[in-house]
């Protein structure tokens, strides 16, 4: 884990109050029974914020033990705190569960910084504000960790929603969502609406506020506006996609598109930032600096370290450019673009200067493991993880932060040739070396 970046996360609704849903435009996708419509019981079932993660309430064991679990599309283990820890208010007590089964196997997950380790078992799991089902799922009971749990984050475990290929200790450990789909009639699809506040929230405000929605088994019309546009899942490990073009305020970065996906591009709710490969990051920052050149900011700001503050309510959003990522479309030679605002990539930070200030960190950072479309991207959009059809959908989120002049957008189609060439083929290596630096 890189502090401030990757799980556990250490990192904009200004337009409408929570709960106010904007009217939907027409949806050209055909209705699919059981997949679309209203999922009232699941709407607003997430809490949290981009800097510390979004979590859902889950119950584990018999009788049920309630825990808050971080939703992470960038990993594939269901892992929960199972021993006392200074940052945990509660933890999974296996000895109190009559349905717990020990798998007599350990699991160790190191990150770039920090780690967790534990013991594998299975137990009955349900999601109170989710589908009305109970499944027997693999659980990693975390007995030791370092720089994993976050003080004040209010979550006690992690729900890895990616594919078995990246599960630990190996791909034979079935991920939770696979178990859910196998054991129930829940369609093989989930969707996420992460709602950034656009302003810093203190602990009590996070507990009281809505953080968004995880719709399990379907798509909720009320959570987005306009149309959903889909990009293929390139390979079922992470949720890997292909970026074919990048623009800053409409200006093409003009890089070989392979650079955008070197060595992969993934959609990851468990990462705070938009993370870009070194060359792409440098080009993007140069372009963002040029676009906002009427004001200069300290070098440390562009590194995501120093905070920049403005008097409350005077943040000059207009000087910062919009960023567009073009994604491979479902049709040959067709792409679409998703556009985020500075309200997404400048992350509000609490408890620093004075109450008369609004302070932000730059939430785009450098990566050595490819592009990571983290919470700052996802907070602009309703994102559909359509596993059944091996695709990811994007639509403008009904809760994204914007101003009166600009809004996040999902637009298409655009003609883009030779998009397959944009994908990078990772040389086959021992998976253990591939996985230890989950930046």
């Amino acid at each position: 884990t890189q502090h401030g970046i990757r799980l556990p996360l250490r990192s904009g609704l200004g337009g409408a109050p929570l709960g106010l849903r904007l009217p939907r435009e027409t949806d050209e996708e055909p209705e699919e029974p059981g997949r679309r419509g209203s999922f009232v019981e699941m709407v607003d079932n997430l809490r949290g914020k981009s800097g510390q993660g979004y979590y859902v309430e889950m119950t584990v064991g018999s009788p049920p033990q309630t825990l808050n679990i971080l939703v992470d599309t960038g990993s594939s283990n269901f892992a929960v705190g199972a021993a006392p820890h200074p940052f945990l208010h509660r933890y999974y007590q296996r000895q109190l569960s009559s349905t717990y089964r020990d798998l007599r196997k350990g699991v160790y997950v190191p990150y770039t910084q920090g780690k967790w380790e534990g013991e594998l078992g299975t137990d009955l799991v349900s999601i109170p504000h989710g589908p009305n089902v109970t499944v027997r799922a693999n659980i990693a009971a975390i007995t030791e960790s370092d720089k994993f749990f976050i003080n004040g984050s209010n979550w006690e475990g992690i729900l890895g929603l990616a594919y078995a290929e990246i599960a630990r200790p190996d791909d034979s450990l079935e991920p939770f969502f696979d178990s859910l789909v196998k054991q129930t009639h829940v369609p093989n699809l989930f969707s996420l609406q992460l709602c950034g506040a656009g302003f810093p929230l203190n602990q009590s405000e996070v507990l009281a506020s809505v953080g968004g929605s995880m719709i399990i088994g379907g798509i909720d019309h009320s959570l987005y506006t306009g149309s959903l546009w889909y990009t293929p899942i390139r390979r079922e490990w992470y949720y890997e996609v292909i970026i074919v073009r990048v623009e800053i305020n409409g200006q093409d970065l003009k890089m070989d598109c392979k650079e955008y996906n070197y060595d992969k591009s993934i959609v990851d709710s468990g990462t705070t930032n938009l993370r870009l490969p070194k060359k792409v990051f440098e080009a993007a920052v140069k372009s963002i600096k040029a676009a906002s050149s009427t004001e200069k900011f300290p070098d440390g700001f562009w590194l995501g370290e120093q905070l920049v503050c403005w008097q409350a309510g005077t943040t000059p959003w207009n000087i910062f450019p919009v960023i567009s990522l073009y994604l491979m479309g479902e049709v040959t030679n067709q792409s679409f673009r998703i556009t985020i605002l500075p309200q997404q990539y400048l992350r509000p930070v609490e408890d620093v200067a004075t109450s008369q200030d609004d302070c932000y960190k730059f939430a785009i950072s450098q990566s050595s493991t490819g592009t990571v479309m983290g919470a700052v991207i996802m907070e602009g959009f309703y994102v559909v993880f359509d596993r059944a059809r091996k695709r990811i959908g994007f639509a403008v989120s009904a809760c994204h932060v914007h101003d009166e002049f600009r809004t996040a957008a999902v637009e298409g189609p655009f003609v883009t040739l030779d998009m397959e060439d944009c994908g990078y083929n990772i040389p086959q290596t021992d998976e253990s070396t591939l996985m230890t630096g989950r930046a």
Partner: antibody, heavy 120, light 108 residues
Framework: QLQLQESGPGLVKPSETLSLTCTVS??????????WGWIRQPPGKGLEWIGN???????YYNPSLKSRVTISVDTSKNQFSLKLSSVTAADTAVYYC????????????WGRGTLVTVSS | EIVLTQSPATLSLSPGERATLSCRAS??????LAWFQQKPGQAPRLLIY???NRATGIPARFSGSGSGTDFTLTISSLEPEDFAVYYC??????????FGGGTKVEIK
Amino acid sequence: QLQLQESGPGLVKPSETLSLTCTVSGGSISSSSYYWGWIRQPPGKGLEWIGNIYYSGSTYYNPSLKSRVTISVDTSKNQFSLKLSSVTAADTAVYYCARLGHGYSYFDLWGRGTLVTVSS
Amino acid sequence: EIVLTQSPATLSLSPGERATLSCRASQSVSSYLAWFQQKPGQAPRLLIYDASNRATGIPARFSGSGSGTDFTLTISSLEPEDFAVYYCQQVYVWPPRTFGGGTKVEIK
């Protein structure tokens, strides 16, 4: 080498406006590498940041002084200025102009300072 | 608001002795901290930036250390010209606005 020199009246009456100018010599105020700032120090006390300006005219002010402060720049004269309105005795201080370098983060070069007394 | 607390308020030492000055931030400022020296009737002078980097022309007897919330300025062997007031300043929050209250190093 680059030098900064503050100038302006040493005595200002209460409720009036304090006006100071900082002249940059030995270098250009239009350098894209620096912000320029004002800091003050009441007699026998610590340092208080007032505000910064970039040659483009972009300004940042101390929230506690913002309603009374204006900082401006005149690139043709290689100068930047401070105006502090509605002064009281509490504004009596040595006023320093300084350059904000090292990635716009640190006050790495200071003027000698000028004492401004607010008194009737 | 980030508050910088310097200690001790006054340090009485003799030339040749080692001086250790402390600056504590009310919350983490990473390594974005500076140290200034101010002699009577003069403007402050930048000694250390980014917690541990000596500014141009600053003698090697001055060194800075620390990160997060606890920082130290060390003068390995006091010279007569080192007796002055020393201030720390955080620039983690930008624009840089917060100075510590100062430590006076006086001749014993």
